[in-house]
């Protein structure tokens, strides 16, 4: 038994015929000693007398409110709830399972951007005597604050398997979010659900990067092109997307949809905010967005009719011009060749790392004894590493050194027995190409003759092939997050850092070598 809140207790019961009930001793919170009687919400009949009441909780009929009295006056109350465990598994009767993966998922969460704000929702068929409360934090040990608002019943009714479900939502905000950092600890969300006298809890654990789903592109417009069946379709970044867009970039897919919403199979995907497409009279053009460097969810579609003029939007897309800085030239005038090369290499890395380990939805890879050494010592790009847009503007050296450290680390991992041992991989497969490209980007950051010290070296490889396979997946998952941040850094650098600013890569390597050495020794980072 444990206290959920003041005077509300949860009794954990093994819900099995052969299981004994739980003995609960209720204490009357009063200085009084004599003439105390007990009743319950089920019965006004006296259940016992004295300062304590010993009861057996075995059924819901034993739960509920117990009250102690003296001379007709209520002294204190205790509400008992039951948390059922059947065959070692806590009951999940209150919420509807949302079947979208092999895992049992009851809570679904999405974020429109990297600000640390996210929304979770769940479904239930129950309409009365229902109460929810939500707690959230980043990490369990030494949790960092996440504040959640009130749970609200959505006006939307969801129909699943010919049954209507009510949808509840909650919005949460991380207190000290760091949009440009590589997350190392997941956000934990716990929903306490109470139906009548039944208590259940539901949890979800995720990185913001994995629950990103941008709003649909806005201000979708068509411009006919002279003497052509083509039109130019243009759009803008959704207002809710993280800024600057040179750093938090999106990629877009355009699709022509025939009459009766028949989908045309050909999708054109671009990084710009416009494209030329064929637009038949009765067709529709639709556009969706996704993070350019990390394969999270696609947005809902925004669509525009080929016959009509003006624009329309789909899903939850909001109006407004937005999109400031989104119509960047692929190679801005005056940007350093090294930044552009870094942008190209890092974007290629993003593509390769996702082909080596495609998105799997939200899958929690099991933790193995000892594998922490390899994956927890990863040099992650953290908040103080200067990889945010402002930090890059002030001094990109800190960030680039951090990226370099990571590249060295992952390059060694990909060349280690973890990836070269059984089960063997094709040398020219995605992992092989990934390894070669990591080397390319590292050499760009550290030309021959420059030797930066690195803090980490990978740990020894596990012996079992299955352990190796699991570790590969974990390393690739971690690498996906790392290269996404690196790609944002190079894209932003290429778009905004000019040679005259002293922030170009070429300038950096001309800096005194002693400066690097000193920075390395006086700017240590703590890793999670």
């Amino acid at each position: 038994i444990w206290e959920l809140e003041k005077d509300v207790y949860v009794v954990e019961l093994d819900w099995h015929p052969d299981a004994p009930g739980e003995m609960v001793v209720l204490t009357c919170h009063t200085p009084e000693e004599d003439d105390i009687t007990w009743t319950s919400a089920q019965s006004s009949e006296v259940l016992g007398s004295g300062k304590t009441l010993t009861i057996q909780v075995k059924e819901f009929g034993d739960a509920g409110q117990y009250t102690c009295h003296k001379g007709g006056k209520v002294l204190s109350r205790s509400l008992l709830l039951i948390h059922k465990k059947e065959d070692g598994i806590w009951s999940t009767d209150i919420l509807k399972e949302q079947k979208e993966s092999k895992n049992k998922i009851f809570l679904k969460c999405e974020a429109k951007n990297y600000s640390g704000r996210f929304t979770c929702w769940w479904l239930t068929a129950i309409s009365t005597d229902l109460k929810f409360s939500v707690k959230s934090s980043r990490g369990f040990s030494d949790p960092q604050g996440v504040t959640c608002g009130a749970v609200t019943l959505s006006a939307e009714r969801v129909r699943v398997d010919n049954r209507d479900y009510k949808k509840y939502t909650v919005e949460c905000q991380e207190g000290s979010a760091c949009p440009s950092a590589e997350e190392s600890l997941p956000i934990e969300v716990v929903v306490d659900a109470i139906h009548k006298l039944k208590y259940e809890n539901y949890t979800s654990s995720f990185f913001i990067r994995d629950i990103i789903k941008p709003d649909p592109p806005t201000n979708l417009q068509l411009k006919p092109l002279k003497n052509s069946r083509h039109v130019e379709v243009s759009w803008e970044y959704p207002d809710t997307w993280s800024t600057p867009h040179s750093y938090f970039s999106l990629t877009f897919c355009i699709q022509a949809q025939g009459k009766n919403n028949r989908e045309k199979k050909d999708r054109l995907c671009v990084d710009k905010t416009s494209a030329k497409v064929v637009c038949h009279k009765d067709a529709k053009i639709r556009v969706q967005a996704r993070d350019r460097y990390y394969s999270s969810s696609w947005s809902d579609w925004a669509s525009v009719s080929c016959s009509g003029s003006g624009s329309s939007r789909g899903g939850s897309g909001s109006g407004g011009s937005g999109g400031g800085g989104s119509k960047l030239r692929a190679v801005p005038e005056g940007s350093s060749p090294a930044w552009i090369q870094g942008q190209q290499l890092s974007q290629k890395l993003c593509t390769l790392v996702w082909s080596a380990h495609p998105p799997m939805g939200h899958v929690d890879l099991p933790r193995e004894e000892g594998d922490g050494e390899t994956t927890s010592d990863v040099p992650r790009i953290q908040c103080g590493d200067g990889c945010d847009p402002q930090g890059l503007k002030d001094n990109s050296q800190f960030c680039l050194q951090r990226i370099h450290q990571g590249l060295v680390f992952y390059e060694k991992l990909l060349g280690s027995d973890i990836f070269t041992g059984e089960p063997s991989l094709l040398p020219d497969g995605p992992v092989g190409q990934l390894h070669a490209n990591l080397l390319g980007l590292r050499q760009l950051l550290q030309p021959e003759g420059h030797h930066w010290e690195t803090e980490q070296t990978p740990s020894p490889s596990p012996s079992q092939p299955w352990q190796r396979l699991l570790l590969r997946l974990k390393i690739l998952r971690s690498l996906q997050a790392f290269v996404a941040v690196a790609a944002r850094v190079f894209a932003h650098g290429a778009a905004t850092l000019s040679p005259g600013s002293g922030s170009g890569l070429n300038d950096i390597f001309e800096a005194q070598k002693i400066e690097w050495h000193e920075h390395h020794h006086h700017h240590h980072h703590h890793h999670h």
Partner: antibody, heavy 119, light 107 residues
Framework: EVQLVQSGAEVKKPGASVKVSCKGS????????LGWVRQAPGAGLDWMGI????????RYAGKFQGQVTMSVDTSTSTAYMELSSLRAGDIAVYYC????????????WGQGTLVTVSS | DIQMTQSPSSLSASVGDRVTITCRAS??????LAWYQQKPEKAPKSLIY???SLQSGVPSRFSGSGSGTDFTLTISSLQPEDFATYYC?????????FGQGTKLEIK
């Protein structure tokens, strides 16, 4: 005053079914579980099972599983116990009893219903 | 199922006597034991619950003790109306089983 009033004696043929009723009064019917106990002539008490009137949650004793069906009509504050495939061994007095909340024993009992099986 | 064994099966005593009936469970049942009194052609009546708590309205000459597997019902001074059959019942694990009964007769 708490009262559990059961239906009258029944005489049934072997293989038939019998349905005994138990009407509760003087207390909040839906908040107490109700159980059934049988007592063969000259024998001891045999716990058959209990049920929750509020959600019809039932716990049967293994020996009665499949032969006994417990049900409830909350609108009339009446519980029912149906025994099927009657044989001579089912001749007994059947009692309904109220389960005490926070305990598991029966604090109030019905007067009993004698069921006789005879061809 | 948990077996409940009462002893003796029957006993003769006189008004004013102190009488003890024991009940043994085949496995530990904590304190979840009740005692009932049944008179001929009547329904059982609750006397003691939770091994030692007296049911409301029951005379204080009745008392119960024990925990785990061994329990006793004591009548401190027998009254004429106490001659009946007494049953113990465990309510720790389903099915909630009864002892076979102890018949208390006038000597």
């Amino acid at each position: 005053e708490v009262q559990l009033v059961q239906s009258g004696a029944e005489v049934k043929k072997p293989g038939a079914s019998v349905k005994v009723s138990c009407k509760g009064s003087g207390y909040s019917f839906t908040t107490y579980w109700l159980g059934w106990v049988r007592q063969a002539p000259g024998a001891g008490l045999d716990w058959m099972g209990i049920m929750s009137p509020v959600d019809s949650d039932i716990r049967y004793a293994g020996k009665f599983q499949g032969q006994v069906t417990m049900s409830v009509d909350t609108s009339t504050s009446t519980a029912y116990m149906e025994l099927s495939s009657l044989r001579a061994g089912d001749i007994a007095v059947y009692y309904c009893a109220r389960r005490r909340p926070g305990q598991g024993y029966f604090d109030f009992w019905g007067q009993g219903t004698l069921v006789t099986v005879s061809s | 199922d948990i077996q409940m064994t009462q002893s003796p099966s029957s006993l003769s005593a006189s008004v004013g006597d102190r009488v003890t009936i024991t009940c043994r469970a085949s496995q530990g049942i904590s304190s979840w034991l009740a005692w009932y009194q049944q008179k001929p052609e009547k329904a059982p009546k609750s006397l003691i619950y939770a091994a030692s708590s007296l049911q409301s309205g029951v005379p204080s000459r009745f008392s119960g003790s024990g925990s785990g597997t061994d329990f006793t019902l004591t009548i401190s001074s027998l009254q004429p109306e106490d001659f009946a059959t007494y049953y113990c019942q465990q309510y720790n694990i389903y099915p909630y089983t009864f002892g076979q009964g102890t018949k208390l007769e006038i000597k």
